[in-house]
């Protein structure tokens, strides 16, 4: 069987939701010593980067200028060390936003509720779309989808203090082309007095996966790490095939 290197990690720098006409940046984190990285879009070669010097950096950035609906979709990347190619990365969905119109987001029964109450968000957009998306700030990968002609419902069920936070919605013209974001709606959830200190909370840290973690290294340590990584991979493939 053909030997391959471990798959790289593909990430969007800052966010995978890119306003139209702005620049998107995708990072492909592979291995020290990789001489070539390829970015694939919808299964076809999209761009090539060759790091310099290859042994001192573990990945590359691909800049995609002037974002539009034709560049929105599924991206993946691969890399090469010598003549050996890696497996393909997982797929990354790159979305273009700020298309057409702005929806309105509202919450029922209201923006401040007691823990245990049932809450429903409503996203409304009068232009032609049937798919709506709800995102919580700091949790942009946890996209909820709902469908409706003009207005979609997002039932949250009985809420806890973990639901506290700021929410926005989008109308979606297809999976990768979204409207402008709604104005945010902040949901406050009050717990019972004795429960409040024990209630789970959901800190809205920035999306850690939307950070490029490329490192530039010097010295023998990384050369040894590369040798060890390659040796382990070599052993792994021979051991299992």
């Amino acid at each position: 069987p053909k030997q391959t290197l471990p798959k790289p990690i593909i990430r969007a720098e800052s966010t995978y939701m890119v306003p139209k006409e702005k620049q998107a940046t995708l990072c492909c984190q592979g291995s020290y010593g990789a001489v070539e990285y390829q970015l694939h879009f919808e299964g076809s070669l999209f761009a090539v980067e060759r790091p310099k010097p290859p042994e001192r950096i573990n990945g590359v950035k691909f800049h995609i200028p002037d974002m539009n609906s034709r560049k929105a979709g599924r991206y993946s990347c691969i890399y090469r060390v010598g003549e050996l190619w890696s497996e393909r990365s997982d797929l990354l969905d790159l979305v273009v936003t700020e298309m057409y119109d702005t929806p309105t987001l509202s919450v029922h029964p209201g923006p401040e509720v007691t823990s245990g109450e049932k809450v429903t968000f409503y996203c409304r957009l009068d232009t032609a779309t049937s798919m709506f998306l709800l995102l919580k700030e700091g949790r942009s990968r946890d996209v909820q989808r709902s469908y409706g002609k003009v207005q979609a419902e997002f039932p949250m069920g009985p809420v806890t203090t973990a639901h506290r936070g700021s929410y926005r919605c989008f109308g979606s013209y297809n999976n990768y082309a979204w409207s402008f974001p709604s104005e945010p709606v902040k949901l406050l959830v009050t717990g019972d007095i004795e429960n409040t200190s024990l209630a789970p909370t959901d800190p809205t840290f920035p999306d850690s996966w939307d950070t490029c973690l490329l490192t530039r290294e010097t010295g023998l340590q990384k050369d040894l790490a590369l040798w060890d990584h390659t040796a382990q991979n070599h052993h792994h493939h021979h051991h299992h095939h």
Partner: nanobody
């Protein structure tokens, strides 16, 4: 079921004031508001009020901000719309609504009153 009864409409000259009332019978309504519809125009939101566990929230259409004030008397289950500095373009049928989403959004379970006419002459 919820019954909504509006009152307080009438005719007034531009710059004048009116106070609309909406009494809700049945269970307590936490989000109530006012919508209006002028002849030949679409119904539009005017103002709404939501009473949360610790805080009361209000929302207004841009066209009435600074002129209209919405308040709620929870004991009477009644919502009021104080309308000052009225303009001819405020002329419309005003409808009370209960069980809205906040801010100022009609949902499938929203309940409506019969309406009260407001006429502002120049």
């Amino acid at each position: 079921d919820v019954q909504l009864v509006e009152s307080g409409g009438g005719s007034v000259e531009a710059g004048g004031s009116l106070r609309l009332s909406c009494a809700a019978s049945g269970y307590r309504q936490r989000t109530m508001g006012w919508f209006r519809q002028a002849p030949g125009k679409a119904r539009e939101g005017v103002a709404c009020i939501y009473t949360g566990p610790t805080t009361t929230f209000t929302d207004y259409a841009d066209s009435v901000k600074g002129r209209f004030t919405i308040t709620q008397d929870n004991a009477k289950n009644t919502v009021y719309l104080q309308m000052n500095s009225l303009k001819p373009e405020d002329t419309a049928m005003y409808y009370c609504a209960a069980n809205l989403a906040y801010p100022l959004t009609i949902i499938p379970d929203t309940r409506w009153g019969q309406g009260t006419q407001v006429t502002v002459s120049s």
